[in-house]
């Protein structure tokens, strides 16, 4: 089950880990606390999963649903052009810097937001079911 | 609601320092960043320093560079400017304000400001 | 550095008219504009971010445009307390440079 290199798609995946939200063939946590974005993705990295990648629209929309206003971290930087955790471009949605400091990238029920990566804000880790398994 | 009170102007001597503190209240001071901006007599705004979150990372104009140092304690919700080699043309007011939030870098409150006056 | 230009420098109207300022950046800023407007012996107050943005508290008769190099604030019907000095800033690198100012005053 789950099989795959440590950027594949989880494939039919069982449940999730205590306090964890299974959505299709993933995992989600939705954080309680707020950590800087560094800090977010230790967080993630330790629990065998990662800040949350967005693969498509679709994807998007739906984890919207569980968002509020508040922003929550998500694996999005900007390194010369803004770039997901797994190496891939963002090329479905948009997001803009309105300052240099602002190289980390948010999410809440409206969209994408950039931010400076040292504001402490709640996060959302992805995962597949099994920790020895692929992270997107 | 915001509240950023500046004070420690005052009268000094070319050469000497002064240390501006601004404090902070109405907001989680450590969820933003902070800076001075300065106003000579009689004109215009001038951006003099930029603090992080953290205080980790620091921006200063051309113009004050080496002579003043801006840090904050986040403990005590307080941000500073410790301004030495006073000259002259450091005579204003000078104001402490805060971003918009999440690194938007405009200034969207300010204080009421502190005069410095530099003259022998 | 960017260099913030404004104009005019000063400028002379009556409550009910509508005023347009201007401020020119000298290289390409995007939207990266905002507006503050400062009363004699007062600190300046916070009013448009990103070009067009409205802050909150703001009245709608302030209006911003503009993107690029060329930016203007608009205030679409004056009112007595709208007498002031306007300041452009380039908001999104260092330094965070400001426009010299336009003082509008009562014709």
């Known amino acids: 089950l789950c099989q795959g290199s440590n950027y594949s798609t989880c494939a039919s995946c069982p449940s999730c880990p205590d306090r964890w939200m299974k959505y299709g063939n993933h995992c989600y946590y939705f954080s309680v606390e707020e950590k800087d974005w560094n800090s977010s993705l230790e967080f993630c990295l330790a629990r065998d999963s990662h800040l949350l990648v967005i693969t498509d629209n679709q994807e998007m929309s739906l984890l919207q649903v569980f968002l509020s206003e508040a922003f929550c971290w998500i694996g999005l930087r900007n390194n010369s052009g803004w770039r997901w955790e797994d190496g891939s471009p963002l090329n479905f949605s948009r997001i803009s810097s309105n300052s240099f400091v602002q190289t980390c990238g948010a999410i809440n029920k409206n969209g994408l937001q950039a931010s400076s990566c040292e504001v402490p804000l709640h996060w959302v880790c992805k995962k597949c079911p099994f920790a020895d398994q692929a992270l997107f | 609601e915001v509240q950023l009170v500046e004070s420690g102007g005052g009268l000094v001597k070319p050469g000497g320092s002064l240390r501006l503190s601004c404090a902070a209240s109405?907001?989680?001071?450590?969820?933003?960043?902070m800076s001075w901006v300065r106003q000579a007599p009689g004109k215009g705004l001038e951006w003099v320093a930029t603090?992080?979150?953290?205080?980790?990372?620091?921006y200063y104009a051309d113009s004050v560079k080496g002579r003043f140092t801006i840090s904050r304690d986040n403990a005590k919700n307080t941000l500073y400017l410790q301004m030495s080699s006073l000259r002259a043309e450091d005579t204003a007011v000078y104001y402490c304000?805060?971003?918009?939030?999440?690194?938007?870098?405009?200034?969207?409150?300010w204080g009421q400001g502190t005069l410095v006056t530099v003259s022998s | 550095d960017i260099q913030m230009t404004q104009s005019p420098s000063s400028l002379s109207a009556s409550v009910g008219d509508r005023v347009t300022i201007t401020c020119r950046a000298s290289?390409?800023?995007?939207?990266?504009l905002a507006w503050y407007q400062q009363k004699p012996g007062k600190a300046p107050k916070f009013l448009i971010h990103?070009?067009?943005t409205l802050a909150e508290g703001v009245p709608s008769r302030f209006s911003g445009s503009g993107s690029g190099t060329d930016f203007t604030l608009t205030i679409s019907s004056l009112q007595p307390e709208d007498f002031a000095t306007y300041y452009c800033?380039?908001?999104?690198?260092?330094?965070?440079?400001f426009g010299q100012g336009t003082k509008l005053e009562i014709k």
């Open positions: 304000a805060r971003e918009g939030g999440y690194g938007n870098l405009w200034f969207a409150y």
């Open positions: 109405g907001f989680t001071f450590s969820r933003y960043y």
């Open positions: 603090i992080s979150i953290s205080g980790g990372n620091t």
């Open positions: 290289e390409n800023i995007y939207s990266a």
């Open positions: 990103n070009a067009k």
């Open positions: 800033q380039y908001h999104y690198g260092i330094p965070f440079t």
